[in-house]
């Protein structure tokens, strides 16, 4: 397993719609074929899992159905963009990516990218 | 190194409107927040909300919301704080700091006198 | 929001004394979103801790900061007549983010 640097902003503000983008750019020290790139969210020293995708290079980053991620990859830039954020899921989310193929395999994991959240006011009761 | 430039002091009348800027340098913009900070005098730090240089994104306090806006020049990597309708209250130093998420690098201060 | 409450609000204390300054929140806090800062007279603030322990770059081992959930603590082991100063504690865990009404520390 080598070590490979991975690059994310410190801090990024969410959409007032729960929708947060961000570029993950990594250092490719060789010319990976596959990669897999995975979301993990830190929050109060827990680490969960929040997505991941294993793409192709050149091909459209595929998360499962029910994921709340989806990405476009160029190069070694890859724009993850997280959706349905509440302000409970304030946290640090942290880029990983490992080059699959071919060998030798690579991992690098970014510093976290700080996200905050807030909930929409709610809307005054209308009547109709 | 990281730098934050703040522009010079201003005397409005009430009513008027003022808008600061900060110039970052030493960093990638981008990758951080501007958060606006101000301090009455003899009094303590008032967090006025904040902006994410990566998106535009802001959040203010409750209590400036309608009067404030944050915006940012990515281009000259320059952050900017209007802040309209003033009052005597308004009266203060007005500072930038970086949000890394913490406030790691501050502007000089720049003081904002109401007064008719 | 959570609100954030400093004790005391001035420390008389001589040069060479032990200051423990302490800072409440209303609600339970991360301790990786609780900073503190210094203020000196006609200067901006300076960030000292962050994440509650870790001190910033080029800060004294002098300063030191603990605690978490709501109690946090701010200690200078031995007064250097340059702490003489205001400090602050703030959080920037959900928003609103919010600062202590700040501790003056001064000569006694």
């Known amino acids: 397993c080598k070590a490979m640097h991975v690059a994310q902003p410190a801090v990024v503000l969410a959409s007032s719609r729960g929708i947060a983008s961000f570029v993950c750019e990594y250092a490719s020290p060789g010319k990976a074929t596959e990669v897999r790139v995975t979301v993990l969210r830190q929050a109060d020293s827990q680490v969960t899992e929040v997505c991941a995708a294993t793409y192709m290079m050149g091909n459209e980053l595929t998360f499962l159905d029910d994921s709340i991620c989806t990405g476009t990859s160029s190069g070694n830039q890859v724009n993850l963009t997280i959706q349905g954020l509440r302000a409970m899921d304030t946290g640090l989310y942290i880029c990983k990516v490992e080059l699959m193929y071919p060998p030798p395999y690579y991992l690098g994991i970014g510093n976290g990218t700080q996200i905050y959240v807030i909930d929409p006011e709610p809307c005054p009761d209308s009547d109709f | 190194q990281v730098q934050l430039v703040q522009s010079g002091a201003e005397v409005k009348k009430p009513g008027a409107s003022v808008k600061v800027s900060c110039k970052a340098s030493?960093?990638?913009?981008?990758?951080?927040?501007i958060s606006w900070v101000r301090q009455a005098p003899g009094q303590g730090l008032e967090w006025m909300g904040w902006?994410?240089?990566?998106?535009?994104?802001?959040n203010y306090a409750q209590k400036l919301q309608g009067r404030v806006t944050m915006t940012t020049d990515t281009s000259t990597s320059t952050a900017y704080m209007e802040l309209r309708s003033l009052r005597s209250d308004d009266t203060a130093v007005y500072y930038c700091?970086?949000?890394?998420?913490?406030?790691?690098?501050w502007g000089q201060g720049t003081l904002v006198t109401v007064s008719s | 929001e959570i609100v954030m409450t400093q004790s005391p609000a001035t420390l008389s204390l001589s040069p060479g004394k032990r200051a423990t300054l302490s800072c409440r929140a209303s609600q339970s806090v991360s301790s990786s979103y609780l900073s503190w800062y210094q203020q000196k007279p006609g200067q901006a603030p300076r960030l000292l801790i962050y994440g509650a322990s870790t001190r910033a770059t080029g800060i004294p081992a002098r300063f030191s900061g603990s605690g978490s959930g709501t109690n946090f603590t701010l200690t200078i082991s031995s007064l250097q007549p340059e702490d003489f100063a205001v400090y602050y504690c703030q959080h920037v865990y959900h928003l609103p983010w919010t600062f202590g009404q700040g501790t003056k520390v001064e000569f006694k």
């Open positions: 030493g960093y990638t913009f981008t990758s951080y927040g």
């Open positions: 902006i994410s240089a990566y998106n535009g994104n802001t």
């Open positions: 700091a970086r949000v890394g998420p913490h406030f790691d690098y």
